[in-house]
Interface confidence: medium
């Protein structure tokens, strides 16, 4: 439970007072306010929203609210030279062109500055050639094409369906396969749930709807021109040729009406199996090129987008801690959107706004948290997590010494079925305890706890009677805090039923149809799921900032470390002969995990018993908890990914959205049977086992008794 002794306030100012102050009606009002016009990063509209949020957070009662600006590389379509794709005949005449914009939703016909669908950071170019259908453009899809089907993508334009993995990984894979252009499209199999109408009559994607998004492979670098350092006014900027993570081939997204026109003519090889078929009435032939009658026709891309150094603005609000002002708990979510941002990000920003208002109300009544709370409205998340990363780069020395926790607050909903949480194992017990205290908003669970409905609908695959909590991957603003700086992090939102809904994300993701009405009519008319997410995010922040002993349980890290070690060992054991030949042993890793488990257990015992009235000892124990996540950071980073420094978790090299455990070992083992120099490859596996074992042992020792 929270304790208020140290903050000198009346008993009514506890977690309950904070939670009771959160109101669904306010979240609804804020969401409406934030979604009436587009707030694209780098635009005047988004700057004005930053100033509005700054002003309102000041009114709510924060101690200070500042704008932090950076000049970063962004990407925009050319207003006078639109991007499109055409089918051309043998004379070079364009016989079909893809649409230049999405038909605007009802009520938004006269809104200006709706950016047309584009792939941010695509280079300019007008490649033409034969088409190859590459399914989701995952690593395994290209293996299937190249190794099994012997189809060469070199010099071809590939068409890939959105879903399963981050779009930047798709583009990287296509580049490595030698493609000269990429067309991304939304297949109804992934973005049209059966039995639901398309927008505006339901929450499904219409044929003219298109998903925008960046196609970078930044690997945590932030601004492509200033990796590792803030993009301030005196930054040394790389030239575009040396920029980090930019794609080298033109890329453009389309909807399924336009995709139908391209895919219906495909010839060449038949799809290898049913997993390559979507829901369009087309054969899903792989190609290359068009079938018989159309074999002389080609596809041509016309991409004229430009990369521009542009000013962005974060809003940073501070609520100073009464007892430990030099310990920071951060709640952050982005403000920039592709268009209206009805879900992404404003359903999250509206929740943050209400959380700030509630904290401000308590502060006006004389309360302060024990630790400092920082609130952030990040800019340019959609362009590669740029606002959060630049701010963290600028403040890295403070953050690595003072950062207790980071709670992310992007979209509050991606469905309305149950809770979804991804976090460090240190927060498992905090999340469990908190959700047991909150009421479930779900139908059929009236009077029951959120923990109960969540556990029933999303059970843990390992532990019965517990809910699923996932690993942190990336694709959101916690990345720099967790993967680079080693600050304990977590995120929570309401999600869909993954069992019955096989589509990727939510259908209208990053389209013009992501409006206030989408949320208010179809996802959460009562805003009860938004309120629940506000209670979870806000409750986590409250506990992290206010509990006398940090609500971290190091024993949960011990449990997952053993699980991850078992998993990576079993992957390696698929190659028993090579392990023997090259003397590959996991003994050091298992030994380190065993030591960690024992030391964590002893630390937890001491945590129960120590004298909490001794401020020095209290601070010492809390610091050991705070710095445990930091202890998993390797200053040298992962191979070829210097900004991914967490040894236990990193975004998957094949899907930025997904988290991988023991990523150094995992990547060293990946596809090892195809490596040209097996001795060198297995040597790298051994080195990565050593790094992991050392890091786990070193982390364990931070929990030992200090003297």
């Amino acid at each position: 439970k929270s304790s208020n002794e140290a903050t000198n306030i009346t008993p009514k100012h506890n977690m309950k007072a904070f939670l009771d102050e959160l109101k669904a009606e306010n979240i609804k009002k804020f969401l409406y306010n934030f979604t009436q016009i587009p707030h694209l990063a780098g635009t005047e509209q988004n700057f004005q929203l930053a100033k509005q949020i700054q002003s309102q957070w000041k009114e709510f009662g924060l101690d200070s609210v500042e704008l932090a600006h950076y000049d970063v590389l962004l990407s925009y379509p050319n207003k006078t030279h639109p991007n499109y794709i055409s089918i051309i005949n043998e004379d070079g005449n364009e016989i079909f062109n893809t649409s230049l914009f999405e038909p605007p939703p009802p009520g938004y016909e006269n809104v200006s500055d709706i950016v047309p669908p584009f792939s941010a950071f695509s280079p300019q170019g007008m490649p033409e050639g034969d088409l190859v259908y590459v399914n989701y453009a995952r690593t395994e899809d290209f293996f299937k094409l190249e190794r099994d089907m012997k189809i060469n993508c070199s010099g071809k334009i590939v068409i890939a369906r959105y879903g399963k993995v981050f779009r930047g990984n798709k583009v990287k894979n296509a580049q490595l396969a030698g493609a000269k252009g990429v067309i991304l499209y939304s297949d109804p199999a992934d973005y049209f749930a059966p039995g639901v109408k398309s927008y505006p009559d339901g929450w499904n994607l219409p044929g003219g709807g298109v998903q925008r998004g960046n196609i970078l492979n930044l690997n945590g670098a932030g601004d492509p021109l200033t990796p590792g350092y803030p993009a301030n006014e005196y930054a040394y900027r790389r030239g575009i040729a040396e920029a980090v993570g930019l794609p080298s081939i033109p890329v453009h997204p389309i909807g399924y009406y336009d995709a139908q026109k391209l895919l219906e003519k495909m010839g060449g090889s038949a799809p290898p199996d049913s997993s390559w078929r979507g829901s369009l009435k087309v054969p899903y032939n792989v190609g290359p090129g068009f079938t018989g009658n159309f074999s002389t026709q080609k596809v041509k891309m016309h991409i004229h987008s430009t990369n521009e150094v542009t000013r962005i603005y974060n809003v940073i609000g501070t609520l100073r801690g009464a007892v430990e002002p030099d310990r920071y708990v951060i709640l952050g979510g982005h403000r920039d959107s592709w268009v209206f941002g009805g879900i992404d990000p404003q359903s999250g920003a509206a929740v943050v706004h209400e959380i700030v208002r509630s904290f401000g109300t308590l502060k006006k009544e004389g309360w302060r948290p024990r630790r400092t709370i920082l609130f952030a409205s990040w800019d340019a998340e959609e362009f590669g997590l740029l606002g959060s990363t630049e701010w963290a780069e600028e403040n890295s020395r403070l953050l690595q010494e003072r950062g207790v926790a980071y709670i992310n607050a992007d979209s509050s909903i991606e469905g309305n079925y149950t809770l979804r949480v991804d976090c460090t194992p240190l927060m498992y017990s905090l999340v469990h305890n908190l959700t047991k205290e909150l009421k479930s908003p779900d139908e059929g669970f009236e009077g029951k706890s959120l923990y109960e409905s969540w556990t029933k609908k999303s059970p843990s695959p390992e532990f019965s009677g517990m809910p699923r909590i996932s690993k942190l991957g990336s694709g959101n603003d916690f990345e720099v805090f967790f993967q680079r700086l080693g600050i304990a992090s977590g995120r929570a939102r309401y999600t869909k039923n993954w069992e019955t809904n096989k589509f990727s994300g939510y259908p209208l993701y990053h389209s013009v149809y992501e409006t206030y009405e989408l949320v208010e009519k179809f996802y959460d008319p009562m805003f009860k799921y938004h309120l629940t997410v506000a209670q979870v995010r806000g409750g986590m922040v409250f506990e992290l900032a206010n509990s006398i002993v940090l609500p971290f349980d190091c024993r949960d890290y011990a449990v997952v470390l053993r699980k991850y070690a078992d998993k990576i060992y079993s992957i390696s054991m698929k190659h028993p002969q090579e392990m023997k030949t090259y003397s590959v042993s996991f003994d050091s890793l298992f030994s380190a995990v065993k030591n960690f488990t024992e030391i964590a257990s002893k630390f937890s015992e001491r945590l129960q018993d120590f004298d909490k009235s001794n401020p020095i000892v209290l601070r010492m124990m809390n610091d050991q908890l705070m710095f445990l996540e930091r202890a998993f950071i390797d200053p040298l980073g992962l191979p070829d990914r210097p900004f991914y420094r967490h040894v236990i978790y990193a975004p998957s090299s094949h899907n930025k959205y997904a988290g991988e455990s023991f990523p150094g070992i995992y990547d060293a083992l990946f596809d090892i049977e195809s490596k040209v120099d097996p001795s060198k490859a297995w040597g790298e596996v051994k080195r990565q086992i050593y790094v992991a074992a050392f890091t786990v042992q070193a982390a364990a020792e931070t929990l030992s008794e200090v003297a």
Epitope: H69, E233, Y234, R237, R238, G239, A241, N307, E308, V309
Partner: antibody, heavy 115, light 108 residues
Framework: VKLQESGPGLVAPSQSLSITCTVS????????VSWIRQPPGKGLEWLGV???????YYNSPLKSRLSINKDNSKSQVFLKMNSLQTDDSAMYYC??????????WGQGTSVTVSS | STVLTQSPAIMSASPGEKVTMTCRAS???????LHWYQQKSSASPKLWIY???NLASGVPARFSGSGSGTSYSLTISSLEAEDAATYYC?????????FGAGTKLELK
């Protein structure tokens, strides 16, 4: 956006020069300000910059003689140059500094170094 | 620091003519960081073309810029009387910022 320089006009050799640049239409907490000079009939020479956070950079040949300061609340930037010689006679401009460009310029103030 | 050499130093052309002036850098400059300014007599310079090829607000479409590496150019497709001025290129490849000596464009 407007920038306006004001200076003494005439400075005696070996004396120091002080010029004030008053800006409007933007905040000095958001943008830096560069100083540039142009001797009569000659080209442009970049002198230095004060960025929004107060950090400065001075062009090497002038580093020992130059200082740039500002008062954000008054929207003013100050250039001070010591030990002036006749070849420091020039039109002195302030300009808003935006990612390595000067996107808005003042009308300039003429400085003559003469006894 | 990077030295910019503009050529010609002075040029004259008739209205309607196509005009090109060049700016050469002593070491490679990113196209993102090469800019042009126009200065008319007894007036302050104006940002004219930024990041090699982007026209500043209010600049007529007859102006264009191009180049990469060490060689850049400013072109006027059809000269008009109001274009008579001195044009300076300016670069960043690390501080200090430097200007070229200028190309003075006169009308015949």
């Amino acid at each position: 956006v407007k920038l306006q320089e004001s200076g003494p006009g005439l400075v005696a050799p070996s004396q120091s020069l002080s010029i004030t640049c008053t800006v409007s239409g933007f905040s000095l907490t958001d943008y830096g300000v560069s100083w540039i000079r142009q001797p009569p009939g000659k080209g442009l020479e970049w002198l230095g910059v004060i960025w929004s956070d107060g950090n400065t950079y001075y062009n090497s040949p002038l580093k020992s003689r130059l200082s740039i300061n500002k008062d954000n609340s008054k929207s003013q930037v100050f250039l001070k140059m010591n030990s002036l010689q006749t070849d420091d006679s020039a039109m002195y401009y302030c300009a808003r500094h935006k990612v390595y460009t000067m996107d808005y310029w003042g009308q300039g103030t003429s400085v003559t170094v003469s006894s | 620091s990077t030295v910019l050499t503009q050529s010609p130093a002075i040029m004259s052309a008739s209205p309607g003519e196509k005009v090109t002036m060049t700016c050469r850098a002593s070491s490679s400059v990113s196209s993102s960081y090469l800019h042009w300014y126009q200065q008319k007599s007894s007036a302050s310079p104006k940002l004219w073309i930024y990041r090699t090829s982007n026209l500043a607000s209010g600049v007529p479409a007859r102006f264009s810029g191009s180049g990469s590496g060490t060689s850049y150019s400013l072109t006027i497709s059809s000269l008009e009387a109001e274009d008579a001025a001195t044009y300076y290129c300016q670069q960043y490849s690390g501080y200090p910022l430097t200007f070229g000596a200028g190309t003075k464009l006169e009308l015949k």
